[in-house]
């Protein structure tokens, strides 16, 4: 086999504004961010990240994973806790360019996912969404 | 259609799997006309420990 | 370690169909798309068609719709392309290439098909 | 169709010799743009991906970069592992193209 498994398949979305994935840098004062590498080797939380372009990533240190008696949903040492999320939308078509984060479909339709959740989560406690993945509903 | 999966992160201690569950599909409706999303079938569930990619997507990795 | 192991190489007869086999080993076969693409003797490398593996759905190159078919299967973690009503200049070695969060990321080591009377 | 026309088509070169290798697209692909490299008897490796980002486990003296509709492939200082066969790949739109391809040989 060959290759490499990569691309930039997370975006960060924080304080009102969407970092995407192709285009702006994460926030540095952000608590987390997300790897962007989209590979096969599970993903962690690291402390911060720069991007710097299409679909790269320089990451900082990983931070400690912790767990919690006393909340319903795993966080960091940071207090942060995590919602997987599953939705179809019926009124798009998959196609594979939705696998690939430098095509105009993904960036678009990423775009317009990340400016809806931070409108459905306007309330405080929202730190960002990632991981973004589309498959063929 | 497209199936969309992700993970979304809240401080600790603000929401729980129902509410986020609930917020959303209250936006639907909104989503529909805003960004023309026609959105179904919505699942929320906590982010099995430890973290990772492939836990969260279900062994999607 | 990610591998795309695909099946030997097939000699034909002009007519007949072929059908090649990619197996997917070191991650979970559902998760991503599987491109396949030819390449003629001494030529290029020519698109035939994608499948996201766990799914119906695939798209194909116009040049190759009718004569080709893609489907998989989950339980064997094997992805396969049929090409049917096989002539000469179909001899060319096929590729598989998988996703992985970006496309044609892996890449199968080829499958030698000859078409001859 | 979008065409993907890269040249040359060979070209000879010492070890220790930068390399170019250009392909240009017949209509706007952004930065849907993969480098892949074909060696005899071995799988395609992909290089870069998204015009300039390196795959893992790519040496660095690999670069891609773009200009207008014009694509770059750079090879900073070739190594005898590098002559091989280099070919471009749009995925911007169906069907997905990939450039004639370039042949590096040993000088």
């Known amino acids: 086999a060959s290759g490499s498994a990569s691309g930039s398949a997370s975006t960060l979305v924080h304080n009102g504004t969407s970092a995407r994935a192709t285009t702006t840098p994460a926030s540095k004062s952000t608590p987390f961010s997300i790897p962007s590498h989209h590979s096969d080797t599970p993903t962690t939380l690291a402390s911060h990240s720069t991007k710097t372009d299409a679909s790269s990533t320089h990451h900082s240190s990983v931070p400690p994973l912790t767990s919690s008696n006393h909340s319903t949903s795993p966080q960091l040492s940071t207090g942060v806790s995590f919602f997987f999320l599953s939705f179809h939308i019926s009124n798009l078509q998959f196609n594979s360019s939705l696998e690939d984060p430098s095509t105009d479909y993904y960036q678009e339709l990423q775009r317009d996912i990340s400016e809806m959740f931070l409108q459905i989560y306007k309330q405080g406690g929202f730190l960002g969404l990632s991981n973004i993945k589309f498959r063929p509903g | 259609s497209v199936v969309v999966q992700l993970t979304l992160a809240f401080r600790e201690g603000t929401i729980n799997v129902h509410d986020v569950e609930t917020q959303f599909n209250q936006y639907k409706t909104e989503a529909a006309s805003r960004y023309n999303l026609t959105i179904s079938d919505v699942s929320v569930s906590d982010v099995p420990f430890p973290f990772s990619a492939q836990s969260h997507h279900h062994h999607h990795h | 370690e990610v591998q795309l192991v695909q099946s030997g190489a097939e000699v034909k007869k002009p007519g007949a169909s072929v059908k090649v086999s990619c197996k997917a080993s070191?991650?979970?076969?559902?998760?991503?798309?599987i491109n396949w693409v030819r390449q003629r003797p001494g030529q290029g490398l020519e698109w035939i068609g994608y499948?996201?593996?766990?799914?119906?759905?695939?798209e194909y190159n116009e040049k190759f719709k009718g004569r080709v078919t893609l489907t998989s299967d989950t339980s064997a973690s094997t992805a396969y392309m049929e090409l049917s009503s096989l002539r000469s200049e179909d001899t060319a070695v096929y590729y598989c290439?998988?996703?992985?969060?970006?496309?044609?990321?892996?890449w199968g080591q080829g499958t030698l098909v000859t078409v001859s009377s | 169709d979008i065409q993907l026309t890269q040249s040359p088509s060979s070209l000879s070169a010492s070890v220790g010799d930068r390399v170019t290798i250009t392909c240009r697209a017949s209509q706007d692909i952004g930065i849907t743009l993969n480098w892949l490299q074909q060696k005899p008897g071995k799988a395609i490796k992909r290089l870069i991906y998204?015009?300039?980002s390196l795959d893992s486990g790519v040496p660095s003296r690999f670069s891609g970069s773009r200009s207008g509709s014009d694509y770059t492939l750079t090879i900073s200082s070739l190594q005898p592992e590098d002559f091989a066969t280099y070919y471009c790949?749009?995925?911007?739109?169906?069907?997905?193209?990939f450039g004639g391809g370039t042949k590096v040989e040993i000088k």
């Open positions: 290439a998988r996703s992985a969060g970006s496309l044609f990321a892996y």
């Open positions: 499948i996201y593996l766990g799914s119906d759905y695939t």
């Open positions: 998204a015009t300039s």
């Open positions: 070191g991650y979970t076969f559902t998760s991503y798309g």
């Open positions: 790949l749009q995925y911007a739109s169906s069907p997905y193209t």
